[in-house]
C-alpha cells in the first residue's frame, strides 16, 4: 500500500475524530481483556479500516486492554478510573513522491498525529486536543524521471505525556493523512498506562 | 564519524538480530547492578562496538539495570518478572550526502530502530518485532558540487509501547544502518520499566 | 505560524479541565509542564495552567523542575518546530534544530545531556514545514537533581499545550 | 531586530595569528549559519565560509582552508574566526553576516605588516 | 566553482534616472525541485558594510524602496533601481548561494553625474 496522492489534510482534526466520533456512555460491561491485574494499562495496534481509515486491534498480536479498560474505534478508549495517565501514541507513515515535476508545495505533505479527549467529566462538547506530533515531508524528485512516482519514503510521528483523566473521559487518535499509514507490525500504535 | 557510505539494508532484521543473538537461558545470576529497590527497570546507553555495530553500556553515565535486570550485548535485556513494562529507545543517525549529483533514490537511506523480543515462554524460534520507528532521509546535495561529500544531516529514530514481557524473555534493539548511529551524549538508548 | 501552527482546540482554550482530587495515597510525584505561549523568543515552562500541574513534590526553580525525592523517574519531553516557505533569505544552508533534556546534580559540576536529538532542516528548499521531537527515559535521579532542557531554534518554536512540554513521573 | 557586532582592527606581524571575533545581540543565533567574507581594496567580496554555531558543523572555501579556523560559543552568541600564518595577503576587511536573516556586521580591518 | 559576472563595472547616471545592471552565472541558479533562483543583490555605501536589498533573485528584503527590482532567471538576473537618488551611490553585488563555495560577482560602481 505504496501511497502517492496526498489526501487533503482535515482542517478541524477533531471534527474527523476517528470517523465519526460519539461521546454516549458505553454500557458497564466486563472489559475485552484482562490479561494483567494491577493498573488500568491499554496498548493499541493500528489496523487498517474500510475506506482507507485508521481503526485500532485491541486483542492481536501485542495488542491489550487491562483492568477495565474499554474500546471501540466509534468511541475510543474508555478509562476505568480518575487518575494520572501516560498516554503515547506512534504513527509510522509512508508514500511517494507523485510523478513528475512541479510544485514542490504540491509534493509537500504535514503528517499530523494528534490524541484527543472527549467525553465523561470534562463534558459533550468539543473534542480537547492533548498532545500531538507533526512531521513534514518533501519527497525528492528526480528531475529526469517525469513517469511514475518517486522513491518510497517512511516516517513516524511519535510523542507521549501525562494527562490526568476521569472515568469515562475516552481518548483517540486523530491523523491527517489516513491513507498514508504504515500498518506493518509494530509501527502504528496508541496506549495508557496509569501511573498515580 | 560522518558517514557517507550507505550500509545496505538488511532484509530480514531478526535475522541480524543484534550482532547474532543467542536464546539460550542466562545463568541465575545477581543482577550486573541493584542501585535501587522496587520494579524492575534498566536503562542502557549506546555504545559503540568493534567492526561498526552498536552496542549498549550497562553502568557508565545515566545507564542503569535495576531489581534483578540482566543484560548482554549478545543476548539483550533480560527481565526478571512475568509483568507490564513500558520499552522505550531512541537511536540518534548522522551521515553526510555522498558526493557529486545522481539519481536521488541512490542518496536516500532508511534508517529502522526496531525492538524485538525473542526466547523465554515466547520460545526459541523466531525474534518476534514489538515496536518500530523508521525515517527516510535524502540528504540534499550541492549540485555543483563533484567533490567531497556534502552537509551533514542529523536525525532520531524513537518509540516507546507497552508490552506484557514474561520471565526469562529478552529484548533486543535491531537497526538498519550500525554505521550511522549517533554516540553523542543522550541520543542514543534504550530502556525498560515495570509499570504492573 | 498561520498556515503551519498547530493550533490549539477551541475546547482547550475556553475551559480548563476538572481538577484531579486523587486521594494522597495514590499521589506520586509527577509534573507536566507546558511552553509558555506569551514568550515567543525563549521558551519558559509554566505549571498550573491548561493541562500542565505540579504534584507530590514536584517544582519548577529558574525554568528546572526539582526533584522531589530520589528514585526512578520517566522523563520526557516534546518540542515542536515550524517555518514559513522561504523564510531564509540569502542562503541556502540548513537550520539547525535541536532539543535536549538536561541533568544538574551535586554529583556533576556540569549540565549532562540526558535526552537529545538534532535535526538539520532545509527552510531554503522546502515549504511551510513541521518538525517534531520527541523523546522519553527513565533515569535514577537524587533529590535535589534539576532537570532543565536546552534549545536551539527557539523562534520556529509551536507553542502550544499540546505540541511544546516537559514532563517527569516517579515510578 | 537583531545585530552582528565585530571585535576592533587589528594590526599584527606576518607569521602571527589573529583572532575575530562577531557576537549577535538581539537573538539566539545557534541554529542559524554565521558565515565570513573577505573584502580586500579592489578585490571585491570573497567567501571564505560558514559555521552551525549549534551544531559546529563547517564549510570552507578550499581556497582558505588552512589558513581561516571558524569556532563558536552558543553560551556567549558570538562566533570567532582565526586566521594564522598572517602575510600582507591577508590583510582586509572581514565581515561576519547571517543570510537567513540578511545581517551583517560592521567589519573588522586586519593589517598585517612588520 | 560557479562564477558570477557583473556589467557594466561601472555606470554615471544622474538623479532620477532609470538604472539596469547584468549579473551572469557560470551555471543555473535555478533550483528544480522550489522553481527559486538562489541569488542575492547587495549594496555596498563608500565606508559601510554591505545590505541586503534582494534575495530569491527578485524578493525586495524588508524596508528596501520599491525603487529597486531584481529580475531574471537560470543564468541571466538584473537588478533594476526606476529612479536613481542621490543616497544609491554604492557598488551594487549579486551573489550565488546555490552552491558551495558562495560566490560574489565582482560589483558595479554606481556614480552619480
Known amino acids: 500500500q505504496d501511497q502517492g496522492g496526498l489526501v487533503t489534510e482535515t482542517a478541524d482534526p477533531g471534527a474527523q475524530a476517528q470517523q465519526g466520533l460519539g461521546f454516549q456512555k458505553l454500557p458497564e460491561e466486563e472489559p475485552e481483556t484482562d490479561l494483567s491485574p494491577g493498573l488500568p494499562a491499554a496498548h493499541l495496534i493500528g489496523a487498517p479500516l474500510k475506506g482507507q481509515g485508521l481503526g485500532w486491534e485491541t486483542t492481536k498480536e501485542q495488542a491489550f486492554l487491562t483492568s477495565g479498560t474499554q474500546f471501540s474505534d466509534a468511541e475510543g478508549l474508555a478509562l476505568p478510573q480518575d487518575g494520572l495517565y501516560y498516554l503515547y501514541c506512534l504513527v509510522g507513515y509512508r508514500g511517494r513522491a507523485p510523478p513528475g515535476g512541479g510544485d514542490p508545495q504540491g509534493r509537500s505533505v504535514t503528517l499530523r498525529s494528534s490524541l484527543y479527549r472527549a467525553g465523561g467529566a470534562y463534558g459533550p462538547g468539543t473534542p480537547e486536543l492533548l498532545l500531538e506530533g507533526a512531521e513534514t515531508v518533501t519527497p525528492v524528485l528526480d528531475p529526469a524521471r517525469r513517469q511514475g512516482y518517486g522513491p518510497l519514503w517512511y516516517t513516524s510521528v511519535g510523542f507521549g505525556g501525562l494527562v490526568q483523566l476521569r472515568r469515562g473521559e475516552r481518548v483517540y487518535v486523530n491523523i491527517s493523512h489516513p491513507d498514508m499509514v504504515d500498518f506493518a507490525r509494530g509501527k502504528t500504535f496508541f496506549g495508557a498506562v496509569m501511573v498515580g | 564519524q560522518d558517514q557517507g557510505g550507505l550500509v545496505t539494508e538488511t532484509a530480514d532484521p531478526g535475522a541480524q538480530a543484534q550482532q547474532g543473538l543467542g536464546f539460550q537461558k542466562l545463568p541465575e545470576e545477581e543482577p550486573e547492578t541493584d542501585l535501587s529497590p522496587g520494579l524492575p527497570a534498566a536503562h542502557l546507553i549506546g555504545a559503540p562496538l568493534k567492526g561498526q555495530g552498536l552496542g549498549w553500556e550497562t553502568t557508565k553515565e545515566q545507564a542503569f539495570l535495576t531489581s534483578g535486570t540482566q543484560f548482554s550485548d549478545a543476548e539483550g535485556l533480560a527481565l526478571p518478572q512475568d509483568g507490564l513494562y513500558y520499552l522505550y529507545c531512541l537511536v540518534g543517525y548522522r551521515g553526510r550526502a555522498p558526493p557529486g549529483g545522481g539519481d536521488p533514490q541512490g542518496r536516500s537511506v532508511t534508517l529502522r530502530s526496531s525492538l524485538y523480543r525473542a526466547g523465554g515462554a515466547y520460545g526459541p524460534g523466531t525474534p518476534e518485532l514489538l515496536l518500530e520507528g523508521a525515517e527516510t532521509v535524502t540528504p540534499v546535495l550541492d549540485p555543483a558540487r563533484r567533490q567531497g561529500y556534502g552537509p551533514l544531516w542529523y536525525t532520531s529514530v524513537g518509540f516507546g509501547g507497552l508490552v506484557q514481557l514474561r520471565r526469562g524473555e529478552r529484548v533486543y534493539v535491531n537497526i538498519s544502518h550500525p554505521d550511522m548511529v549517533d554516540f553523542a551524549r543522550g541520543k542514543t538508548f534504550f530502556g525498560a520499566v515495570m509499570v504492573g | 505560524l498561520p498556515g503551519v501552527g498547530l493550533t490549539p482546540s477551541a475546547a482547550q482554550t475556553a475551559r480548563q479541565h476538572p481538577k484531579m482530587h486523587l486521594a494522597h495515597s495514590t499521589l506520586k510525584p509527577a509534573a507536566h509542564l507546558i511552553g509558555d505561549p506569551s514568550k515567543q523568543n525563549s521558551l519558559l515552562w509554566r505549571a498550573n495552567t491548561d493541562r500542565a500541574f505540579l504534584q507530590d513534590g514536584f517544582s519548577l526553580s529558574n525554568n528546572s523542575l526539582l526533584v522531589p525525592t530520589s528514585g526512578i523517574y520517566f522523563v520526557y519531553s516534546q518540542v515542536v518546530f515550524s517555518g514559513k516557505a522561504y523564510s531564509p533569505k540569502a542562503t541556502s544552508s540548513p537550520l539547525y534544530l535541536a532539543h535536549e533534556v538536561q541533568l544538574f546534580s551535586s554529583q556533576y559540576p556540569f549540565h549532562v545531556p540526558l535526552l537529545s536529538s538534532q535535526k538539520m532542516v532545509y527552510p531554503g528548499l522546502q515549504e511551510p514545514w513541521l518538525h517534531s521531537m520527541y523523546h522519553g527515559a527513565a533515569f535514577q535521579l537524587t533529590q535535589g537533581d534539576q532537570l532543565s532542557t536546552h534549545t536551539d531554534g527557539i523562534p520556529h518554536l509551536v507553542l502550544s499545550p499540546s505540541t511544546v512540554f516537559f514532563g517527569a513521573f516517579a515510578l | 531586530q537583531g545585530q552582528l557586532q565585530q571585535s576592533g582592527a587589528e594590526l599584527m606581524k606576518p607569521g602571527a595569528s589573529v583572532k575575530i571575533s562577531c557576537k549577535a545581540t538581539?537573538?539566539?543565533?545557534?541554529?542559524?549559519?554565521i558565515e565570513w567574507v573577505k573584502q580586500r581594496p579592489g578585490h571585491g567580496l570573497e567567501w571564505i565560509g560558514e559555521?552551525?554555531?549549534?551544531?559546529?558543523?563547517?564549510n570552507y572555501n578550499e581556497e582558505f582552508k588552512g589558513k581561516a579556523t571558524f569556532t563558536a560559543d552558543k553560551s556567549s552568541n558570538t562566533a570567532y574566526i582565526q586566521l594564522s600564518s598572517l602575510t600582507s595577503e591577508d590583510s582586509a576587511v572581514y565581515y561576519c553576516?547571517?543570510?537567513?536573516?540578511?545581517?551583517w556586521g560592521q567589519g573588522t580591518t586586519l593589517t598585517v605588516s612588520s | 566553482d560557479i562564477v558570477m559576472s557583473q556589467s557594466p563595472s561601472s555606470l554615471a547616471v544622474s538623479v532620477g534616472e532609470k538604472v539596469t545592471m547584468s549579473c551572469k552565472s557560470s551555471?543555473?541558479?535555478?533550483?528544480?525541485?522550489?522553481?527559486?533562483?538562489?541569488l542575492a543583490w547587495y549594496q555596498q555605501k563608500p565606508g559601510q558594510s554591505p545590505k541586503l536589498l534582494i534575495y530569491?533573485?527578485?524578493t525586495r528584503d524588508s524596508g528596501v524602496p520599491d525603487r529597486f527590482t531584481g529580475s531574471g532567471s537560470g543564468t541571466d538576473f538584473t537588478l533594476t533601481i526606476s529612479s536613481v537618488k542621490a543616497e544609491d551611490l554604492a557598488v551594487y553585488y549579486c551573489?550565488?548561494?546555490?552552491?558551495?563555495?558562495?560566490?560574489f560577482g565582482g560589483g558595479t560602481k554606481l556614480e552619480i553625474k
Open positions: 530569491w533573485a527578485s
Open positions: 559555521i552551525s554555531p549549534g551544531s559546529g558543523s563547517t
Open positions: 538581539g537573538y539566539t543565533f545557534s541554529s542559524y549559519w
Open positions: 553576516a547571517d543570510g537567513y536573516h540578511g545581517y
Open positions: 551573489q550565488q548561494y546555490y552552491s558551495y563555495p558562495r560566490t
Open positions: 551555471q543555473s541558479l535555478l533550483y528544480s525541485t522550489n522553481q527559486k533562483n538562489f
